[in-house]
Each structure stands twice: as structure tokens, then as C-alpha cells.
């Protein structure tokens, strides 16, 4: 009686179970009464990453420099190429098909996490006691100057965008 289900790494065709092709190889002929499944290795710049019955290998991803991409990890017959972005850019999606410049944190905000090739800058508002007066992709919020430690007093209060202004203490005669 012909099988209705096959073992792992097999597939059902013409009422018989045939072996799947291993990762890195494509199917060129189903098994027959007289022969096993016939598979051939994927060509240069092609891959298949699972046990399969694909008749064509997938093309490796192209990391297009015109889109700001570069190769992070070269593909093999069993894995796709992994792209990342050039310095100063990050991927627009998880699949990293294009790149955009890193975001700068505006005055009043500091860098919480510096951008990588795959993630954008994460900014945070400067909390009380801290400020940022620049638009930057690297600068964190800086603490207000401590006037006391310089034997000075606050003449102008700080904000999230400006430092405090220190001045000499009023001498009472």
C-alpha cells in the first residue's frame, strides 16, 4: 500500500517517499523505483538554507553600495549574505534593504544609545540637572555645572538646553 505520510527529511510524490535535498543543494530529479532523489549543489552566489525540494536555489542578497549597504557576512551555499550599513547610516528594516543617516538628538535631548549599522540613534529628554545645547548623534545629556564646587553661585538657572550660569557670590559688608 502506498504511503500517505513520509519520514522527516522526505516528501511524498507519485505515491512514494523521496528524500529531500540537503541545505546547499537543489532538486534535479525526484526519486524513482531505480534511483534516489538527485540533487545538485547551488551555484556561486546562490543558497538554500533548509532541507528542500526546490528546483532553483535562491540568489544571495546584493548589498548595494548605492543604497549605503556593505557586506557584513558573506553568504554560503547554505546561508544568505547579511548586509549592514556604511558608517553613519543604519538599516530601514530588519531585512536591511536600504540605509538612512543616523538621527541626531536635538538640543534638549541626549543620546541614550548610539546608532549601529542596524539600529538608529535613541534619544532621551535631558532630565532636570542635565542639558544638551547641540544637535548630535553622539553627545549625551551633560550635567549642569556645579557652581558650589567652584565657590560660585547660580546666576541663571539651567534648562534642558542650557547650562547654569555661575557668578561670584554677593559679599555682604
Amino acid at each position: 500500500e502506498p504511503p500517505t505520510a513520509c519520514r522527516e527529511k522526505q516528501y511524498l510524490i507519485n505515491s512514494q517517499c523521496c528524500s529531500l535535498c540537503q541545505p546547499g543543494q537543489k532538486l534535479v530529479s525526484d526519486c524513482t523505483e531505480f534511483t534516489e532523489t538527485e540533487c545538485l549543489p547551488c551555484g556561486e552566489s546562490e543558497f538554500l538554507d533548509t532541507w528542500n525540494r526546490e528546483t532553483r536555489c535562491h540568489q544571495h542578497k546584493y548589498c548595494d553600495p548605492n543604497l549605503g549597504l556593505r557586506v557584513q557576512q558573506k553568504g554560503t551555499s547554505e546561508t544568505d549574505t547579511i548586509c549592514t550599513c556604511e558608517e553613519g547610516l543604519h538599516c530601514t528594516s530588519e531585512s536591511c534593504e536600504s540605509c538612512v543617516p543616523h538621527r541626531s538628538c536635538l538640543p534638549g535631548f541626549g543620546v541614550k544609545q548610539i546608532a549601529t549599522g542596524v539600529s538608529d540613534t535613541i534619544c532621551e529628554p535631558c532630565p532636570v540637572g542635565f542639558f544638551s545645547n547641540v544637535s548630535s548623534a553622539f553627545e549625551k545629556c551633560r550635567p549642569w555645572t556645579s557652581c558650589e564646587t567652584k565657590d560660585l553661585v547660580v546666576q541663571q538657572a539651567g534648562t534642558n538646553k542650557t547650562d547654569v550660569v555661575c557668578g561670584p557670590q554677593d559679599r555682604q559688608r
Epitope: 522526505q10 528524500s19 534535479v28 530529479s29 526519486c31 524513482t32 523505483e33 531505480f34 534511483t35 534516489e36 532523489t37 538527485e38 545538485l40 528546483t55 532553483r56
Partner: antibody
């Protein structure tokens, strides 16, 4: 039913290219492979190679540098070319449908001689 | 390549004799699927080979029951239980487990 018929010149000069055609019926070239096998007079059988349904090929490593197998699906024909032939390539050449090992062509004798 | 070695290369026998031909491969013919792709062919002068046995022991349709195949791994046998006049021919073993496919050198069965 499945049938295969080999054809081509029976005499080829040394150093020239041997060219044979296998015309098939009863099965479809876009879905099935075709093998070439040869047999020198009074000797054993030697697998030459195969062209698969999608056009990919496998060749016997001992002949790989000289052999090309191609096909024309629309004409139901498979072609064998063997370059730089010598007397050692004198043989009966058979074609065979993959999965139809019970059905061989009748074979065609090719003699390499000047 | 896998070498297929047949023995004997020729033998003389009489009608009614039991004939055994052996075939040894240089490496195992067991595929990772568990199947063993070992065929036996019969060839008569001026004719193409005809399939007798496939996958070691399966008789092809229309092949008389006097032909049987056995063996495993690297050692295989074709047995003709009672030789008939039409069985005088050359017999080849063949493996299709590994590319390139290879054949034994043949065993010629002649009339004694």
C-alpha cells in the same frame, strides 16, 4: 510507450567532435532526465552523463573536459557532443530515460578512424 | 568513483544448472535514505541491456522467477536457479546510488 532513438554519423575522424542525437517519445523532457551510456566493442558499459529536466548536467569525471550534453525540449531531442575523439571512443552509444531503466535506445555504433 | 567488481568474468554452465554471479562495490551502496540502488542487467549480442533486478532484490516486471538478487552494503549476488537456453548472455551489475553511476565489467554465461 517510452521510446528512445539514437542517431548520428557512424564514422568520426580522430581529434574531431562526435555529435549524437537522442529523440524521445512517451515521456516529457521538461519533467525527466536523459542519460548517455556507451559500450566499446566487446567491453563493458560506461556512464557518460545526464541532462536533468531543468537543464542541469552531471558528467562522468573521466570525460568531463570533453563532453557536453544539451537538449531541445520542443523537439524532444537530447544531444551529446564529445570533443577530441580518439580510437578509444569507438563504442555503441545508448541513451536512456531517467526512471525508465527498462527502456534503452537500440544504440548507435560510432567508429573513430581516419 | 565507485568500482564495481564482478566475478567470475565468464563461466560455462549447462541448462538446469544453478548459477551465481557476485558483484562487489568499492564502497557501500546504502544511501542515507536506507535504500540500496543496485541493478542487474542482461545483455545479448547486438542488443541493448535489459533490466532484470533493481534495488538489490526486486525483480522487474516480466522477469522470470528463476532470477533473484540478494546482498547488502558492498556485496551482492545474482542467482539463476535453473539455467534456461535463453539465459546464455552477459550480465552486468550497476550502481545508481552515487554519481557517477558505474557498472561491473560483466560476466559472460556460456554453454558448457
Amino acid at each position: 510507450q517510452v521510446q528512445l532513438q539514437e542517431s548520428g554519423p557512424g564514422l568520426v575522424k580522430p581529434s574531431e567532435t562526435l555529435s549524437l542525437t537522442c529523440t524521445v517519445s512517451g515521456f516529457s523532457l521538461p519533467t525527466s532526465g536523459v542519460h548517455w551510456i556507451r559500450q566499446p566493442p566487446g567491453k563493458g558499459l560506461e556512464w557518460i552523463g545526464v541532462i536533468w529536466a531543468g537543464g542541469d548536467t552531471n558528467y562522468n569525471p573521466s570525460l568531463k573536459s570533453r563532453v557536453t550534453i544539451s537538449k531541445d525540449n520542443s523537439k524532444n531531442q537530447v544531444f551529446l557532443k564529445l570533443s577530441s575523439v580518439t580510437a578509444a571512443d569507438t563504442a555503441v552509444y545508448y541513451c536512456l530515460g531517467h526512471g525508465h531503466f527498462d527502456v534503452w535506445g537500440q544504440g548507435t555504433l560510432v567508429t573513430v578512424s581516419s | 568513483d565507485i568500482q564495481m567488481t564482478q566475478s567470475p568474468s565468464s563461466l560455462s554452465a549447462s541448462v538446469g544448472d544453478r548459477v551465481t554471479i557476485t558483484c562487489r562495490s568499492s564502497q557501500s551502496l546504502v544511501h542515507s535514505s536506507g535504500n540500496t540502488y543496485l541493478q542487474w542487467y542482461q545483455q545479448k549480442p547486438g542488443k541493448a541491456p535489459g533490466l532484470l533486478i533493481y534495488k538489490v532484490s526486486n525483480r522487474f516486471s516480466g522477469v522470470p522467477s528463476r532470477f533473484s538478487g540478494s546482498g547488502s552494503g558492498t556485496d551482492f549476488t545474482l542467482t539463476i536457479s535453473s539455467l534456461q537456453p535463453e539465459d546464455f548472455a552477459t550480465y552486468y551489475c550497476s550502481q545508481t546510488t552515487h554519481v557517477p553511476w558505474t557498472f561491473g565489467q560483466g560476466t559472460k554465461v556460456e554453454i558448457k
